[in-house]
């Protein structure tokens, strides 16, 4: 808390300018009018204030707006945003995408801070859903943003927003998140033709069910190994050797290098060895010829 002291004669600030960098902390407190600061916030960013001086400016704004800053001030906070706590930000009502962009720009190149996370949360909750423009903006600043959301939060993403998602935005998503995003992507891209559809849906296939993988295997898609390895194990297991061969096309040759890893490892164990032998890849561990295969999941369903 800065002690209240009278402003020395002739030092009263008429505007926010470079002369203020020579003011001591107590002089800033005494000589800068909070209302003037609020109207000229856009100038603060261009002036090389020290962190201690920025603390004083923040304190003045806090006193002026105890219920939270108006958006006209928030939009021009610039580096002062880095001084805000999540508690400060929870008082804000940010509705403009331009404001959001301006503040994200301040934090650009850094990890997502608690302040930024709170800001985004406030913004998205205010909008009611993650629309395409917001998603575009957030993933541009934080490619991992989408995968930082819970499945529940992802359920508020409308299918139309999926068009803004780039493959790298899904790199860190886990299967539970892809389970939510895949049906939305399927809906978003449903009117595209075969090859174009596959290019768009490919990144989301970690959430695809068996039936959709079987359908894709009939379309000469030549899925690459990186995509295949991210498929749900339970979705891959029921696929036949012929279906996997059609699904992967020339990439089927990569199965040998991946025989130790899921889902390939578990899939091999479910196939007949003589079917695996038809691939000519030396994949071992299938069900020996002459053995009867019992589908226990089917048996459980019947009992």
């Amino acid at each position: 808390e800065v002690e209240k002291t009278a402003c020395p004669s002739g030092k009263k600030a008429r505007e926010i300018d470079e002369s203020l960098i020579f003011y001591k902390k107590w002089e800033l407190e005494a000589c800068v009018d909070a209302a003037l600061l609020a109207t000229q916030m856009d100038r603060v960013n261009a002036i090389p204030f020290t962190y201690e001086q920025l603390d004083v400016l923040k304190h003045k704004l806090d006193e002026l707006y105890p219920q939270g800053y108006p958006e006209s001030v928030i939009q021009h906070l610039g580096y002062l945003f880095l001084k805000m706590s999540p508690e400060d930000i929870r008082k804000w009502n940010v509705t403009s995408l331009e404001t959001l962009k301006a503040l994200l720009e301040v934090n650009k190149g850094h990890e997502m801070s608690p302040q930024v996370a709170t800001l985004i949360d406030r913004f998205v909750k205010g909008r009611g859903q993650l629309d395409k423009d917001t998603l575009d903006t957030l993933t541009a600043f934080y490619p991992g943003y989408l995968c930082s959301l819970s499945p529940e939060e992802l359920s508020s993403v409308p299918p139309s927003s999926i068009w803004a998602v780039r493959p790298q935005d899904l790199d860190t998503c886990d299967p539970r998140q892809l389970d939510v995003l895949y049906p939305k992507a399927r809906l978003a891209f449903q009117n595209m033709n075969g090859s174009e559809y596959f290019v768009k849906i490919q990144s989301f296939l970690g959430g695809a069910p068996t039936e959709d993988l079987k359908a894709l295997s009939q379309q000469n898609v030549s899925m690459d190994l990186a995509t295949f390895m991210k498929l749900r194990t339970d979705a891959v297991l029921p696929l036949t050797v012929a279906e996997v061969q059609k699904l992967l096309g020339p990439h089927v040759e990569g199965l040998k290098a991946e025989e130790r890893h899921r889902p390939v490892r578990d899939w091999i164990l479910r196939q007949r060895q003589d079917d695996l032998d038809t691939l000519g890849l030396g994949l071992q561990g299938g069900i020996p010829n002459g053995y009867l295969v019992l589908d226990l999941s089917m048996q459980e369903a019947l009992s």
Epitope: D224, L225, A226, M229, H251, E253, G254, K256, A257, E258, E259, R260, H261, G280, L281, G282, L283, Q284, G285
Partner: antibody, heavy 121, light 107 residues
Framework: EVHLQQSGPELVKPGASVRIPCKAS????????MDWVKQSHGKSLEWIGD????????IYTQKFKGKATLTVDKSSSTAYMELRSLTSEDTAVYYC??????????????WGQGTTLTVSS | DIQMTQSPASLSAYVGETVTITCRAS??????LAWYQQKQGKSPQLLVY???TLADGVPSRFSGSGSGTQYSLKINSLQPEDFGSYYC?????????FGGGTKLEIK
């Protein structure tokens, strides 16, 4: 610590066979494939084949089919390579090497010290 | 089977220099590529796997790059201990061939 221990140098006569052991320690033997590599004096490396110790599944390069046989003894965590009908062309250093256990597993991360085989009458 | 063509076959450079070794595959190997270093009389050592991932303990002056059929290993600011032979190896399909090797000598 992962270690692959191979046997010392072998001197054998043409037409004979030899079995080279590679004893693994410091990791779960059945969790990683074992590859075998040949290096003739002053030459490049030549991949022979690969064995999955868990199920005994093998794969060989065409040149070594009928020449090399890869086996494992799970109880002693040892991989073996048998070379038969030996000729002077088989004189080389033979390495066993463990294959990486990551997705996109393109690499041999631990190597034995090599066994020098000399075929001479 | 996919063949690996490595170049140059030999190379001499000064300590502190930057060198690049390349490997061309006869078909697309989808980044399933490793690089090894071998010193005289020693076993090879893994440097890079998956075309660009540095193996544990490998200095950051080594880097792998490439895709499809063209791959390279770059060594920045060569150190005396970097001299030796370098080999690439692919892991696509079922025959995992090595390149012919590059002998890196000190000038």
């Amino acid at each position: 610590e992962v270690h692959l221990q191979q046997s010392g140098p072998e001197l054998v006569k043409p037409g004979a066979s030899v079995r080279i052991p590679c004893k693994a320690s410091g990791y779960t033997f059945t969790d990683y494939n074992m590859d075998w590599v040949k290096q003739s004096h002053g030459k490049s490396l030549e991949w022979i084949g690969d064995i999955n110790p868990d199920n005994g599944g093998t794969i060989y390069t065409q040149k070594f089919k009928g020449k090399a046989t890869l086996t494992v003894d799970k109880s002693s965590s040892t991989a073996y390579m048998e070379l038969r009908s030996l000729t002077s062309e088989d004189t080389a250093v033979y390495y066993c090497a463990r294959r990486l256990h990551y997705y996109g597993s393109s690499g041999l991360d631990y190597w034995g010290q090599g066994t020098t085989l000399t075929v001479s009458s | 089977d996919i063949q690996m063509t490595q170049s140059p076959a030999s190379l001499s450079a000064y300590v502190g220099e930057t060198v690049t070794i390349t490997c061309r595959a006869s078909g697309n190997i989808h980044n399933y590529l490793a690089w090894y270093q071998q010193k005289q009389g020693k076993s090879p050592q893994l440097l890079v796997y998956n075309a660009k991932t540095l193996a544990d303990g490998v200095p950051s002056r080594f880097s792998g790059s490439g895709s499809g059929t063209q791959y390279s290993l770059k060594i920045n600011s060569l150190q005396p201990e970097d001299f030796g032979s370098y080999y690439c190896q692919h892991f696509w399909s079922t025959v995992w061939t090595f390149g012919g090797g590059t002998k890196l000598e000190i000038k």
